[in-house]
């Protein structure tokens, strides 16, 4: 039993972690600067998307890049519990705090703000430079989706790295996982064409959920053959003229649930991965 | 002046490097096994490409993946001159060999075989599983292209890493370069749509040349609107019914030079990067 409550311990761990973050601002500022620069570069490359076949390719390309970038950037989250492993064991054994207080304290003060910022920055810069769907709900759905991808990828990093002493193995494992997840995200291969004995792997792909949600959000209702007269040559039948046609060819459900089920899946993955990370910390102290 | 000729020194360095390679086969065998497994996975995912709109997406996707994989795999080449830096300086000062003998010896015995193997393995496995263009010349052009990409990426790695003492900085720099090169390769963004003040960057992108060559090789003469005569005059700007239409939309020159200029560009990059690497080794010994 502890003399202090869970909430008091949580506040204490959060406060200390946040102070460490502010006391060593180089890393945080560097991350923000890199994100801003990358956002501006992406914005410049894709500036002012067209409503034609290149518009389809460029929309899909930029959404894929943003999704996979969120994943690979989250690899750095492996450090969260690794670098302080000895300190955690020492302080836990000394009775400073519960595992749960330390776990949620670190998440609240470190993971939550540092994974939220890039999503906000990217969306704010990229959205208007590219001229994505000009509605408030589409803007915030994109921001929320990128956050969910970042959180689920970071949670996976924690689940793999928690309790380990070296970062390198976890980083390598994460990178390999993300490469395979990237293949199954839906840009490099049309997911409807994969053999059934392999296609189930797509349901374990974090970028697949993020990319699907971003595409559903952006493509629905778009016209990619604007002004195409109904009297023209028949070869236009092979064109992808609407966002719905594109989404259907990608095997994406057009209903509202077709959007939100991706966020539900990401939320489930976050819960599962964080539970694994927590249990690993719990078992770590038992064997320390 | 040296008592032994350049050729003798070259043979000696090559022989020793090759012996080291055979004496520590784990790394080489591991690389081959990983390449075979990845080749089989890619083959299974993309098995039997269709001749419809999904066939366009899947062909482009797999060619993009193979190109970027060759690039990112080549990051490991940074180690070639870094891990033996102290030994090289010691042996050079002791008059064992010329810088040129060491440089070309290492390239011949280490870089040449270890970068050639993945290209051969990937092509042999993937080509037939996917059902790519069933002609011998297309098969060997693909193999040659993947080799050229691997060599130019490895040469870039050497140019960046030569003379350095730690691998990590060079690896990070390489990775960042390849991420930007990947954006400009032509899948994630239609290169014809990039603003002129930015589009010149594509000419510095290794995967862009590889990807363009692979697409030119695979798409030319393909029909993606089954049941529609491919020779019919297509007045629709939105449909992609032939490989030629697809390549034109990507801004790819359909002439034979449109294929080979990519290999010429990669060859030029190899020469430039290897020259930089050689000069860095040359200056290294002056300051040691």
């Amino acid at each position: 039993s502890y003399t202090t409550s869970f909430c008091h311990q949580l506040r204490w761990v959060s406060k200390r972690s946040f102070k460490n973050l502010l006391g060593n601002p180089q890393a945080s500022i560097a991350q923000i600067i890199v994100t801003v620069i990358l956002g501006l570069v992406i914005g410049a490359i894709y500036f002012g998307l067209n409503n034609d076949s290149t518009g389809i390719q460029n929309r899909a390309g930029v959404l894929f890049f943003l999704t996979t970038n969120q994943c690979f950037s989250s690899v750095s989250a492996v450090e969260l519990f690794v670098v302080e492993k000895k300190l955690f064991i020492h302080e836990y054994i000394s009775g400073y705090y519960r595992v749960s207080s330390y776990f949620f304290g670190k998440l609240l003060s470190d993971l939550l703000p540092m994974r939220m910022l890039p999503s906000i920055i990217f969306t704010c810069i990229v959205y208007f430079m590219l001229g994505l769907k000009p509605t408030a709900d589409a803007f915030f759905i994109m921001m929320f989706t990128l956050m969910m991808v970042a959180y689920s990828a970071s949670s996976m990093a924690l689940a793999i790295a928690a309790g380990q002493s070296v970062v390198s193995v976890a980083t390598l494992l994460m990178t390999i996982c993300f490469v395979f997840m990237m293949i199954f995200s839906g840009l490099l291969v049309n997911l409807t064409t994969i053999a059934s004995w392999l296609s189930w792997l797509q349901y374990f792909s974090i970028p697949r959920y993020g990319f699907t949600a971003l595409q559903h959000n952006e493509f629905l209702g778009q016209n990619f053959c604007p002004g195409l007269n109904a009297t023209v040559n028949n070869t236009c039948n092979y064109a992808t003229c609407t966002g719905e046609e594109y989404l259907t060819k990608q095997g994406i459900d057009l209903s509202p649930w077709g959007l939100w089920k991706n966020h539900v899946a990401l939320a489930c993955m976050i819960v599962i991965f964080l539970t694994i990370a927590y249990l690993k910390l719990l078992f770590l102290k038992k064997y320390s | 002046s040296y008592t032994t000729s350049f050729c003798h020194q070259l043979r000696w360095v090559s022989k020793r490097s090759f012996k080291n390679l055979l004496g520590n086969p784990q790394a080489s065998i591991a690389q081959i096994i990983v390449t075979v497994i990845l080749g089989l996975v890619i083959g299974a995912i993309y098995f039997g490409l269709n001749n419809d709109s999904t066939g366009i997406q899947n062909r482009a996707g797999v060619l993009f993946f193979l190109t970027t994989n060759q690039c990112f795999s080549s990051v490991s080449a940074v180690e070639l001159f870094v891990v033996e830096k102290k030994l090289f300086i010691h042996e050079y000062i002791s008059g064992y060999y010329r810088v040129s003998s060491y440089f070309f010896g290492k390239l011949l015995s280490d870089l040449l075989p270890m970068r050639m193997l993945p290209s051969i393995i990937f092509t042999c496995i993937v080509y037939f599983m996917l059902g790519l263009k069933p002609t011998a010349d297309a098969f060997f052009i693909m193999m040659f292209t993947l080799m050229m990409v691997a060599y130019s990426a490895s040469s870039m790695a050497l140019a960046i890493a030569a003379g350095q003492s730690v691998v990590s900085v060079a690896t990070l720099l390489m990775t960042i370069c390849f991420v930007f090169m990947m954006i400009f390769s032509g899948l994630l963004v239609n290169l014809t749509t990039i603003a002129s003040w930015l589009s010149w960057l594509q000419y510095f992108s290794i995967p862009r040349y590889g990807f363009t060559a692979l697409q030119h090789n695979e798409f030319l003469g393909q029909n993606f609107c089954p049941g529609l005569n491919a020779t019919v005059n297509n007045t629709c700007n939105y449909a992609t019914c032939t490989g030629e239409e697809y390549l034109t939309k990507q801004g790819i020159d359909l002439s034979p030079w449109g294929l080979w200029k990519n290999h010429v560009a990669l060859a030029c990059m190899i020469v430039i990067f290897l020259t930089i690497a050689y000069l860095k080794l040359l200056f290294l010994k002056k300051y040691s």
């Epitope: 409503n51 769907k133 000009p134 509605t135 209702g221 778009q222 016209n223 990619f224 053959c225 604007p226 002004g227 195409l228 007269n229 109904a230 009297t231 023209v232 028949n234 236009c236 039948n237 064109a239 003229c241 609407t242 046609e245 259907t248 | -």
Partner: antibody, heavy 118, light 106 residues
Framework: EVKLLESGPGLVKPSQSLSLTCSVT?????????WSWIRKFPGNKMEWMGY???????NYNPSLRSRISISRDTSKNQFFLQLNSVTTEDTATYYC???????????WGQGTLVTVSS | DIVMTQSPSLLSASVGDRVTLSCKAG??????LAWYQQKLGEAPKLLIY???SLQTGIPSRFSGSGSGTDFTLTISSLQPEDVATYFC????????FGSGTKLEIK
């Protein structure tokens, strides 16, 4: 010359299904284009309802997706509209038209008035 | 959905007059706008597409202009057969129609 003609009952009871047929002449519906349904309410408000493509793929207005179905009979060169659980709000003149994607409608039928009333 | 607002809802003009009909979009629709003419008891007829392109077989007295959110249909010299209701349609995002302008002769 492409011609489209709508047919179906002029009166439908609330909560029942509205079913209309569009017969196409001068063009085979499987050869190309998207075959649409549009309706014009009393008071001139017009609404695109959905279409069935030459390949049989359907695309519906999101506001109607839960109760609309468009199908076809290729042997008769006809396509159909079914709207379930109708209310008096569905009283309108229903048109069929030829289009490609979300674009201007170059060919229209004459329209058929459907009244929903008990 | 993008809301299309047409004004006026009723317009009276004399034969030979230059008539201007307005259509406003709730958001930027580039130039993805079409104009239709519908006479009583008839199907709508496409007049203009892409804001300013005249459909084949339509008299040259009809012209369209505008881009972004504000569009106009102009009849340079009103004829008796032009009495009809005129609709605009946007096709930038899904497709929606304006509520129409009824044109009559004084």
């Amino acid at each position: 010359e492409v011609k489209l003609l709508e047919s179906g009952p002029g009166l439908v009871k609330p909560s029942q299904s509205l079913s209309l047929t569009c017969s196409v002449t001068g063009y085979t519906i499987t050869s190309g284009y998207d075959w649409s349904w549009i309706r014009k309410f009393p008071g001139n408000k017009m609404e695109w309802m959905g279409y069935i493509s030459y390949s049989g793929w359907t695309n519906y207005n999101p506001s109607l997706r839960s109760r609309i179905s468009i199908s076809r009979d290729t042997s008769k060169n006809q396509f159909f509209l079914q709207l379930n659980s109708v209310t008096t709000e569905d009283t309108a003149t229903y048109y069929c038209a030829r289009v490609r994607g979300y674009n201007p409608f170059a060919y229209w039928g004459q329209g058929t008035l459907v009244t929903v009333s008990s | 959905d993008i809301v299309m607002t047409q004004s006026p809802s009723l317009l009276s003009a004399s034969v030979g007059d230059r008539v201007t009909l307005s259509c406003k979009a709730g958001q930027n629709i580039n130039n993805y706008l079409a104009w239709y003419q519908q006479k009583l008891g008839e199907a709508p007829k496409l007049l203009i597409y892409n804001a300013n392109s005249l459909q084949t077989g339509i008299p040259s007295r009809f012209s369209g202009s505008g881009s972004g959110t504000d569009f106009t249909l102009t009849i340079s010299s009103l004829q008796p057969e032009d009495v009809a209701t005129y609709f605009c349609q946007q096709y930038n995002s899904w497709t929606t129609f304006g509520s129409g302008t009824k044109l009559e002769i004084k």
